[in-house]
């Protein structure tokens, strides 16, 4: 396929990636599906600079990112190494809290109101951010 050289309509370009910021809420898995059907993924934060960019666009609102530990260890959805990568957890987080009464612990990561990360119940309907990299071999995205 041809290389994607510019971002789709309504996406924001930054540092050779395209970002889409939701204005409604979904459970983490549904948000993940949404991004994948756009040939994208939930945002993967790899630097403080990217953290600040995303934080600027989402504001003080709980927002899903592409990080989860539903199968044990924490993993980024695009395969970026978690252990050696950028992290911005709130103090005492992640804590896999069971006290919410919703069953199970907390397996999905989100940006909190101050931008730092927290783990939470994956079913909560938070906003989300999709990301796709430019210059990746892919078909052109649709135009509106």
């Amino acid at each position: 396929g041809s290389e994607r050289t510019c971002c789709p309509v309504n996406w924001v370009e930054h540092e050779r990636s395209c970002y889409w910021f939701s204005r409604s809420g979904k459970a983490w898995a549904d948000a993940d599906n949404y991004c994948r059907l756009e040939d994208a993924h939930l945002v993967v934060v790899t630097s403080w600079e990217e953290q600040k960019f995303v934080q600027h666009h989402i504001g003080p609102v709980n927002t899903w990112m592409g990080l989860h530990d539903q199968n044990g260890p924490w993993k980024w959805v695009d395969g970026t190494d978690y252990e050696t990568g950028f992290k911005n957890w709130r103090p005492e987080q992640p804590d896999d809290w069971y006290g919410h009464g919703l069953g199970g612990g907390e397996d999905c990561a989100h940006f909190t109101d101050d931008g730092r990360w927290n783990d939470d119940v994956c079913q909560r309907p938070y906003r989300w951010v999709c990301e796709t990299e430019l210059d990746k071999a892919s078909q052109e995205p649709p135009l509106l």
Epitope: L37, Q139, P142
Partner: antibody
């Protein structure tokens, strides 16, 4: 004009396989996600599967997961549905449909005429 | 999965009548709803998307409304070519789900 034409339907025995094709014309095929939707005789519409623009990502109804595979060849402007381990309840008219070109919109704005699959011994 | 409950399942009406069909979602789907028309032996045709937006070329006698969980589809003055089956469909989440359909018949 924008057109979708399905083919490959027929009568097949339970447990056997069939591959449906959908030839697209009149639009930039690679810019659209695509669906398969089916309709059993005298019944309503049932969504079967969706595939992203590039073909890298796909999703299925639980009723066909693990048995059906949606794929596409953008160089040939063609969508496919590989149906394995067919069951009597898979008997239906199968439609391919174009996904509306808007982020997150999974509605169908263009439909083919349908191809009939009958699973019977 | 999101269940879509459409009612009535069938109705009889005369040319010129105002017809209203309802669709209820089992959870909030915002305005992520489409309406389709299907005639016997034919493929469905998109009429309304985003709950209330007309597809290009669709007559203005067709209209949609609602948000959240409750939606309506109205034909303001039924025409002979409108006798068909109508389906709602949600696209808030996968799997995509359709209502059971409403068959509009001639009285």
């Amino acid at each position: 004009q924008v057109q979708l034409v399905e083919s490959g339907g027929g009568v097949v025995q339970p447990g056997r396989s069939l591959r449906l094709s959908c030839a697209a014309s009149g639009f930039t095929f690679s810019s659209y996600g695509m669906h398969w939707v089916r309709q059993a005789p005298g019944k309503g519409l049932e969504w079967v599967a969706i595939i992203s623009y590039s073909g890298r990502n796909d999703f299925y109804a639980d009723s066909v997961k693990g048995r059906f595979t949606i794929s596409r060849d953008n160089s040939k402007n063609t969508l496919y549905l590989q149906m394995n381990s067919l069951r009597a309840e898979d008997t239906a008219v199968y439609y391919c449909a174009r996904r509306i070109a808007a982020a997150g919109h999974y509605g169908m704005d263009v439909w083919g005429q349908g191809t009939t699959v009958t699973v019977s011994s | 999965d999101i269940q879509m409950t459409q009612s009535p399942s069938s109705l009889s009406a005369s040319v010129g009548d105002r017809v209203t069909i309802t669709c209820q979602a089992s959870q909030d789907i915002y305005n992520h709803l489409s309406w389709y028309q299907q005639k016997p032996g034919k493929a469905p045709k998109l009429l309304i998307y985003d709950a209330s937006n007309w597809e290009t070329g669709v007559p203005s006698r067709f209209s949609g409304g609602g948000s959240g969980t409750d939606f309506t589809f109205t034909i303001s003055s039924l025409q002979p070519e409108d006798f068909a089956t109508y389906y709602c469909q949600q696209y808030e989440n996968l799997p995509l789900t359709f209502g059971g359909g409403t068959k509009v018949e001639i009285k």
